[in-house]
Interface confidence: low
């Protein structure tokens, strides 16, 4: 990301991960994909684990890291916050291990910035209730 | 409030389609599971089709594959259940419902009926 | 397909009697099992999900367990408003059939 030429944002193309609260990223991604196309295949592998609901934060988490925010001010793209790692890894993990799938190395919590402050920048991501609940669904993108 | 209406049901005969309609309100069909259940007279509940529209998913009973196709309208917030070849069997209330949290199925319609008989 | 086979299919039971609807599911599933009550007329109502947890607004005298591939929904103190037919349902992780739904247990007034 050496100059401003090259540092263009892109906008995020995968449906997914677009009205999540910014619509612009640069690969390579976090888990090193070069292309968009490439990210979303893998993103769909998680579509069960959203569908289940096992966290409301785990779709705006998984986009953090397959398309991280990019920002024309700063050269680096702008991921997850261990702290959302940690939360959605607490929530989803049990429901991975019951249908026989481990938690993914390359979501290992320990790869992202414990917090967001000027050293490393990360994003926190939207509030998670305590206890998924049905009449708490996750507050999703185009809630009325 | 979470809501969701059905419409579209009514006699038909055997061999016809119809159309059933779900509008929702007070949530965001995208980011949900919709379903249509339905119950024959006197009957269990039958899980009949679901569909997870932000992510272009569907999934249907056997007894409908090829003869039901459900869809989504995001834009109208809006699921549908068209309904072709129907047949005797196929009478019965169509809930539309929608789930949340391991599938559960957290709000219903207040379902309409569905009658196939010459 | 999983099959869910709920029993008993009807019983009768009095007001303040302790009562237990088992579901057996044919091949080891997970925990996402919900139980319903409907009443004549009326649309389903969600009791329980995740096979233990109770949905809100939902009285405390409902709870729901799981042992293998049973589940269990108890009524630990009948109520005359709790006279109605009870389901479960199973949902899959991600197939063909995604939602399965027990025949139903009737509980009606001894």
């Known amino acids: 990301f050496g100059d401003e030429e090259e540092r263009r944002c892109d906008p995020i193309r995968i449906s997914m991960c677009q009205n999540l609260g910014y619509n612009v990223t640069k690969m390579p991604n976090l888990v090193g994909h070069e292309l968009q196309t490439d990210a979303e295949l893998q993103l769909t592998t998680f579509t069960p684990l959203i569908q289940y609901g096992c966290s409301s934060q785990l779709q705006f988490f998984l986009c953090s890291v397959y398309v991280p925010m990019c920002t024309e001010k700063i050269n680096i793209p702008i991921g997850p916050c261990g702290g959302m790692c940690l939360s959605v890894k607490r929530r989803c993990e049990p429901v991975l291990k019951e249908f026989g799938f481990a938690w993914p190395e390359s979501l290992n919590c320990s790869k992202f910035p414990p917090q967001n402050d000027h050293n490393h920048m990360c994003m926190e991501g939207p509030g998670d209730e305590e206890v998924p609940l049905p009449h708490k669904t996750p507050i999703q993108p185009g809630e009325e | 409030e979470v809501q969701l209406v059905e419409s579209g049901g009514g006699l038909v005969q055997p061999g016809g389609s119809l159309r059933l309609s779900c509008a929702a309100s007070g949530f965001n069909i995208s980011y949900y599971y919709i379903h249509w259940v339905r119950q024959a007279p006197g009957k269990g509940l039958e899980w009949v089709a679901s569909i997870y529209s932000s992510s272009s998913y569907t999934y249907y009973a056997d007894s409908v594959k090829g003869r039901f196709t459900i869809s989504a309208d995001t834009s109208k917030n809006t699921a549908y259940l068209q309904m072709n070849s129907l047949r005797a069997e196929d009478t019965a209330v169509y809930y539309c419902?929608?789930?949340?949290?391991?599938?559960?199925?957290?709000?219903w319609g207040q379902g309409t009926l569905v009658t196939v008989s010459s | 397909d999983i099959q869910m086979t709920q029993s008993p299919s009807s019983l009768s039971a009095s007001v303040g009697d302790r009562v237990t609807i088992t579901c057996r599911a044919s091949q080891s599933v997970s925990s996402a099992v919900a139980w319903y009550q409907q009443k004549p007329g009326k649309a389903p109502k969600l009791l329980i999900y995740?096979?233990?947890s109770l949905y809100s607004g939902v009285p405390s005298r409902f709870s729901g367990s799981r042992s293998g591939t049973d589940f269990t929904l108890t009524i630990s103190s009948l109520q005359p408003e709790d006279f109605a037919t009870y389901y479960c349902q199973q949902s899959g992780w991600w197939g063909v059939s995604l939602i399965t739904f027990g025949q139903g247990t009737k509980v009606e007034i001894k």
């Open positions: 995740s096979a233990s």
């Open positions: 419902a929608r789930s949340s949290y391991a599938w559960a199925i957290d709000y």
